[in-house]
Structure formats: structure tokens, C-alpha cells
Amino acid sequence: ENSFEMQKGDQNPQIAAHVISEASSKTTSVLQWAEKGYYTMSNNLVTLENGKQLTVKRQGLYYIYAQVTFCSNREASSQAPFIASLCLKSPGRFERILLRAANTHSSAKPCGQQSIHLGGVFELQPGASVFVNVTDPSQVSHGTGFTSFGLLKL
Amino acid sequence: ENSFEMQKGDQNPQIAAHVISEASSKTTSVLQWAEKGYYTMSNNLVTLENGKQLTVKRQGLYYIYAQVTFCSNREASSQAPFIASLCLKSPGRFERILLRAANTHSSAKPCGQQSIHLGGVFELQPGASVFVNVTDPSQVSHGTGFTSFGLLKL
Amino acid sequence: ENSFEMQKGDQNPQIAAHVISEASSKTTSVLQWAEKGYYTMSNNLVTLENGKQLTVKRQGLYYIYAQVTFCSNREASSQAPFIASLCLKSPGRFERILLRAANTHSSAKPCGQQSIHLGGVFELQPGASVFVNVTDPSQVSHGTGFTSFGLLKL
């Protein structure tokens, strides 16, 4: 148990996470994350599972955020915009979208970079997982600091 | 000591800051900030130093954020995108990038405005400083509310 | 009083809100919100009033945020960029801008989507209200998760 755990007492430990994007060869729209670089994982009350979802053990209000930087070109992409979605999977419930952001592709060649930030306060149940979905993971930028995902319990 | 200090008791005072961008004639890529307008500086456990960095006295987890609005034009700018970086300098450690966002320049004339938002949870050591670096400070918009920087201790 | 209220004790209840955008036929630049979908309203210490402002009962530091997704076209819009503003109305004070973000209109046809995120720490007085203003509400996207508004008390 690390130092964050004790700061607020055993009954109300600090719970927070910040994970870093990881390039993936998987053909899935769900982004992959890793505990690497300057990451945060306060204690075992929040965990990164399968490299793709942050799962919490305690019910409560959480501020959840994600940042996605991507590089795309209008001609090389579908007509639909690049969309990043913050999604929730609670035990016994269907997945649902919490937040979305959309950016039209750039006309810059070979591609134009753009950044999206999502964030909001949501109630999570014990065992709930949050994850980030994008329209085209191959366009996501994985350079230092460009794409990250995290939460903090209020 | 102001009213925020006491709300959570002497042992765990509220620590938060929100500072406002300031135009600078300095030839540096580090943005300048001021305690002006509707700013926040909860107490002396966080300080704005040299108008450029927020420095904390206590170790812990902090949600740190920055917003940068800029106006640029593709033809008048370098080919590289506009990049805003949230950076950390801890005592005895090298500066490092915590978060970055990138936006390709607009084709609008004379320039097109765009806004970037960065935010994440990070552990800071006593004496650690965070600051914001951009590729071209002359493109940053300093109108009311457009560009700001802050943190809060969890 | 719901479960969030009790978590930190009667003296220091958890205060947070997250509301969802609502299309409006009103010819006002102030966005409309609703307690619908996956919304948050921790207790009666924060309320959504007239569908347009979040009003707090207790003085203190709050992290306030808004996300606005919009779809616009350069030719069909005014030359001015799309601007989203987070504004404050305190009792006995004039309204003021806390945060703003600006994005130049897209050249995509019929319109190009873009997302703006605003967020910062501010002191609010009892009875203070925060609201979101945009240059053209008709351009705002109201699909699931695209446009939202919230706060949390530190």
C-alpha cells in the first residue's frame, strides 16, 4: 500500500490513476494504455485491466478524463470525423458512452495533428470500468504526453 | 492565511491555483502568468514563481491543467504544428514533459484561432514546479479567459 | 439527501454536478442543460436552475468544466470564430467570463465538427451561478456525450 493510501485515513484513501497510451497491433477501436513513463496508480482500489480499462473497487463520484492526439488527413480518411469516446461498463449493465468529442480531419499533408480532451464527473459502481474508444486507432499519436487517460475519486 | 486554508484543517489544507496568461516580450517558449483577474491562489503552499511556474510545497497527487488559445496561419507558420506542453521540474531531476497537445495551423487569414486543453493527475514532490511551454508564444491569445493554467491537490 | 452527501460527513458533503446539453428553440446564446442520461447531481447544495445555470449554496473552491461540440462551415458562418465561454454570475455582481475557447470554422461541407473543452478552479460565493455561452447555439451538437457541463467542490 503506498503513501497516497494513508493520507486520508483507511476509510477514505486517495484514489487516482493516470496511464499512458500504447501503440497496439490489435484491430480494435479501444485504445491501449500502460503504466509507464510518468504514470499514476494510487493503490489497488483502481487498476488497469488488460491494458484497456480503468476499473474501480469503490462506489463513488469520479472525475474521469482522457486526452487523445491524432494525425489525420481529409482525403485519406473516411468522410466521418475522428471521434473519441469515453465509455463505461458497469457490472450487469450494457456499455454506455459518457463523453464524446469529434474533430473533422485536417487538409494538411501527409496528416494534420489535432488534440481532443474529454472530462467529467460520474458515479461509478464497484467493479465499474471506463475505457476510451476512437474511430481509427491507427491515427492516434503516441509520442510523449500526447495521449493519456485517468481518473480521480472525489 | 485565507479561508481555504482552514476548511480541511491545518493538517490537510486546500491547495489550488488558477493563473491568467500574460503577454511577454521575452524570447522564451515558456508562457508567462499572473495573479490577475479572477485568479485563485489558495495559500502559500502553492506559489507562482517568476511569473512562469507553479511551485508546490507539499508532496502529493495533483490534478494539473492548462488551456491555451492561439491564432496561427498555415502559410505564415512553420510546417510543424502548434504544440503546447505541460512540463515538470522537480528538485534534482531533469525537466520532463507530462502532457502535450498539438494542433495543425489553420488556413484562415490573417490567422485562425484554436484552443487546446491539457489536464492530468500527477504526483509532485516538495519544491516541484510545473510550467507550460509552447512552440510559438507570439501566437497565444491573451484575451479574457482564453489562456490559463492551474492545479488542485487531491 | 443521497449517498454522496454522507461520505465526507455532514459538515463537508461531496458536491458535484454533471449535466447534459439540451437543444433549445430559444434565441439565446446561453446553452440549455438537463438532468438526463448519465447525469450527476450530488445533492441540493448544487442545483440546475432554469435549465441553464449551475448554482451553488456553499462558498468554496470549485473545479468547473464544460465541453462543447459544434458543427460549422466557414462559408456559412460569420468570419468570427466559434467561441464558448464559461461565465459566472455572483449575487450583487456583474456577470463575468471565467474561461473562453475559440475555434475557427471548418471548411468541411456541409459542416465540420470540432470539440472544445474548458476547465478551471474558481472560488464561488453562496448563490453563485455558472453558465455556458456560445456564439451560435444552432451549431452545437447534442448527440450522446458531445456537449456537457459540470463542477465539483474541492
Epitope: G37 | V30, K89, G92, R93, F94, E95, I97 | -
Partner: nanobody, 129 residues
Framework: EVQLVESGGGLVQAGGSLRLSCAAS????????MAWFRQAPGKEREFVAA????????DYSDSLKDRFTISRDNAKATLYLRMNNLKPEDTAVYYC??????????????????????WGQGTLVTVSS
Amino acid sequence: EVQLVESGGGLVQAGGSLRLSCAASGRTPLNYHMAWFRQAPGKEREFVAAISSLLGSTDYSDSLKDRFTISRDNAKATLYLRMNNLKPEDTAVYYCAARETTHYSTSDRVNEMRAYDYWGQGTLVTVSS
């Protein structure tokens, strides 16, 4: 690539002062963390002081911070070390070192030699009693 050339060394009496310079050429030194190390005869090279690339924040060896001051002039692409109240035990070859800002090595600490990518040839400082 960055080339580093130190100068300003020499013979000085105890209690005296010196200012060392390190001229950087090649890629823009604005993008580099800079530091001074020193190596006394028969001893290992040790950290003296460092200055960060963006903020210009300084870090010092605890034993030297009261007498030595590191600074940089980005316009001149030059790093400096001002040494006051010199002592015979300050006799050493003083080396300038640089590390790229974007470089992420196994070391994150400014006082570790292995963290630096580029080194000068050194300048000798001799303090007589």
C-alpha cells in the same frame, strides 16, 4: 550533435574567484539541459551544478551551492560557472555537459554522469594555498 568548448580555467589563489565558460555550437543549445562536473586528480568525476533548458532552474551539489553559481546566456549559446572563495580542494578539471531536453534515458537525475549525451574536453582550475 553539439560541440562543447570550456574556457576560463587557470591558476588562482585561495579565496579568489573565477568564471568558467562553455561555448556550445551545433544544434540549438536552447534544447539542452546543461551542467558542470569536475574531476580532481586521482578522484572520480563529480557533479557541480546543472541548469534546465526551459525554466533555467538550477540544481547544485550541496557542498558547493554557497560558493558556485551556474548560469546560461541562450543568445550567446554559452554556459557559465561563477566560483567564489575558491579553496585548494576545488582544484580539478571542470567539464561542461549537455543532454537533450527530449531525451529519456535510464537516468532522470541531474547529478548522474550517464544522463548526459555530450561532454567538453575540460578546463583545468588550480587553486594554490
